[in-house]
């Protein structure tokens, strides 16, 4: 109890009436008007409640506060009087705010602001629409994906901000008179090949395709390892080189190094480099055969396989490269005795003679060219004395009828070891690779070591066997005549040739042995 007669226990938001009673403050109410016990409370009266007598008037909102209330203008409206709050309708001066005037950038870049009572809307510019999640924000309409298909099928649609373009597809161009961009654009395929707009490598030929182009290897060329054919970035290499690789199953560092050189020469090969490339290959071969290194430690049969592979490949490579030479006669010789003679001509009707240190070859020009082949005619002769090392003890396989005849009359005499190579090994080739049956024979004159008296001299060629190796054979070759250090041979095909000395005695006037000649 207060000495002044006022209760000290009055609840919050109340005041004492006397020493035993309290009353709620204005804006608060309790269960009974006079509070006589401390357990009672004073609660805020919500003047803004629906049944309340308070009326703020139009364009305004009532805001309840602790023990009171405020009238405020609704969003989008403001009081003319400037007073932010008021208590009743008579004090209400709320009127609409023109947001568009207040903030001209309200609709950002792509909309026009339109004022409404208490608010505003954004009217989007052509090519824009209101964003569903933010109806005040205009966003670009993608005409290309909206299903309108506004462009011709020969073009592709490019969406722009607020617009779109119909552009020619890559590899296409506007048809004459057509623009490139508006929705009436119509395009046609560009022939990149004839217009020179392609990026094909010089090792390929350009082929136009609809809307694009592809690059295909030139005839006689193949795609570089790992690069597909018929692509824009196809790069090819001359098959002349790519097929001449070490024979399978032969392990020789010396041989690998030779073939590495061949592949290096082929990597950036161009037709204009033919002369230098031929010389470099023969230089490398000359060095290989001068110092065969670990090739000499291989079993004899493997050495014969290597020789066979080298002879076969060399012929193909020289034939391929020679077609890129200009007309004329070429002669190259190398330290270890390798020699090349080449004649390149537009086809002429005469015989050709190629002369070398140890061999001469004569044949008709008309053999050189395959009919219908537009390239130049090439006749070539390579002497490869170093090949003799690899062909030591190579077998001689006679035709069955010759073999049988000899077997009947000279039993056991041919078992007397392998024939001896008397001459350099030579390889003859033409631009025409179909040389298995010449229409007129080729004549070779070999210079060679002295013949041991009463030994048989044979004109032979190297026959590449099915197994990739080979042997000496006489089929299609005949010995026209022989002196102590020279022999004339005539053959009806081209390959690699030599003169052998057979290991048996020749009987005087032996009719059987004349069969061989």
């Amino acid at each position: 109890q207060d000495s002044r007669g006022c209760a000290r226990w009055c609840p919050q938001d109340s005041s004492c009436v006397n020493a035993t009673a309290c009353r709620c403050n204005p804006g608060f109410s309790s269960f009974s008007e006079i509070i006589t016990t401390p357990m009672e409370t004073c609660d805020d009266i919500n003047e803004c409640a629906t049944l309340s007598k308070v009326s703020c008037g139009k364009f305004s909102d009532c805001w309840n506060t602790e023990g009171s209330y405020d009238c405020v203008c609704s969003p989008g409206y403001e009081p003319v009087s400037g007073a932010k709050t008021f208590k009743n309708e008579s004090e209400n001066t709320c009127q609409d705010v023109d947001e568009c005037q207040q903030n001209p950038r309200l609709c950002k870049s792509y909309g026009t602001c339109v004022n409404t009572l208490g608010s505003y809307t954004c009217q989007c510019l052509p090519g824009f629409k209101l964003k569903p999640e933010d109806p005040k924000l205009c966003t670009d309409v993608n005409e290309c994906t909206s299903g309108q298909n506004p462009c011709h099928s020969s073009t592709h649609c490019l969406n722009n901000v607020g617009s779109y373009q119909c552009r020619c597809r890559p590899g296409w161009q506007p048809i004459p008179g057509s623009p490139n961009g508006p929705n009436n654009t119509v395009c046609e395929d560009v022939d990149e090949c004839s217009s020179g707009q392609h990026q094909c490598d010089s090792s390929t030929v350009c082929f136009n395709t609809v809307g694009s182009y592809s690059c295909r290897c030139r005839p006689g060329w193949k795609p570089r390892h790992g690069i597909p054919n018929n692509q824009k970035d196809t790069v090819c290499e001359d098959m002349t080189f790519s097929t001449w690789t070490p024979p399978p199953g032969v392990h020789s560092q010396t041989l690998s190094r030779f073939f590495d050189k061949v592949q290096d020469l082929g990597r950036d090969y161009k037709p204009g480099l033919a002369n230098n490339t031929i010389q470099s290959i023969l230089q490398a071969l000359d060095e290989l055969l001068e110092a065969p290194g670990d090739l000499e430690t291989l079993p004899r049969l493997q050495q014969h396989c290597v020789a066979s592979h080298l002879l076969d490949g060399l012929e193909d490579v020289l034939r391929g490269l020679s077609k890129n030479l200009s007309n004329g006669l070429l002669n190259f010789s190398y330290p270890a005795g390798t020699e090349l003679s080449l004649e390149v001509q537009k086809q002429v009707d005469r015989s050709v003679t190629l002369r070398q240190n140890q061999a001469v070859m004569q044949l008709d020009w008309n053999q050189a060219q395959k009919s219908g082949d537009p390239g130049p005619s090439v006749v070539g002769l390579v002497s490869i004395p170093g090949m003799g090392k690899l062909l030591a003890e190579a077998p001689l396989v006679l035709e069955p009828e010759k073999q049988m005849l000899l077997h009947e009359t000279h039993q056991g005499l041919l078992q007397d070891g392998s024939p001896i190579l008397l001459s350099d090994v030579i390889s003859a080739f033409l631009s025409n690779n179909d040389t298995q049956n010449l229409s007129s024979p080729v004549t070779f004159t070999f210079s060679h070591r002295s013949v041991i008296p009463r030994q048989k001299v044979l004109c032979v060629f190297w026959e590449h066997g099915q197994n990739g190796c080979g042997h000496w054979a006489t089929t299609g070759c005949s010995t026209i005549g022989t002196r102590d250090t020279s022999t004339i041979c005539r053959c009806t095909h081209l390959s690699s040739f030599a003169v052998l000395m057979a290991h048996y005695d020749v009987q005087e006037e032996d009719p059987v042995l004349t069969v061989i000649t």
């Epitope: 050189k261 290096d264 950036d268 037709p271 002369n275 470099s280 230089q283």
Partner: antibody, heavy 118, light 106 residues
Amino acid sequence: QVQLQQSGAEVKKPGASVKVSCKASGYTFTNYWMQWVRQAPGQGLEWIGAVYPGDGDTRHTQKFKGRVTMTADKSTSTVYMELSSLRSEDTAVYYCARGFTAYGMDYWGQGTLVTVSS
Amino acid sequence: QIVLTQSPATLSLSPGERATLTCSASSSVSYMHWYQQKPGLSPKRWIYDTSKLASGVPDRFSGSGSGTDYTFTIRRLEPEDFATYYCQQWSSNPLTFGQGTKVEIK
């Protein structure tokens, strides 16, 4: 006799381009690749690339991809090397050299000094 | 790319002495070439295809090697031989040079 005559010295600003020429004489222009090699002051030799005059085919190092253009004019037996977007580290003597795989670069131009400075 | 490492970087010798320069490749190389360069001058081809002397090169120079290891030798140094020598491979693109060996007078 074989001769390779290069264009004169150039001073360029960073970002600019330079085009160096190399006129060949005394041999068949299409029988060799023409190589481009550069040498920065006090440094070693650096291969830029090569052009084959016969068909305009080129080879170049990845380092210069997109910046170097090598061309050949058969009518004047001249090759060109253009280097764009120059930076100070492109300051060097630029050489052209006749080349073939098995022979190396057997004839060299006298060199063209390109200075890149702001 | 094939990296060529030349050693030593500098070789200090007196005239009459033997100089041996080496060039080591990160992969096997078939065609190795050597060039001589003197200050302010263009390089000159000196040895090509491992061991062949370029025209006008005296026979006191020689080259050898195969695979990844190559050697350039000057049998008896003459005053005009003091220069920088570069090896260069042509077995794969890009073509690469060694960083050079400077042969200087001791």
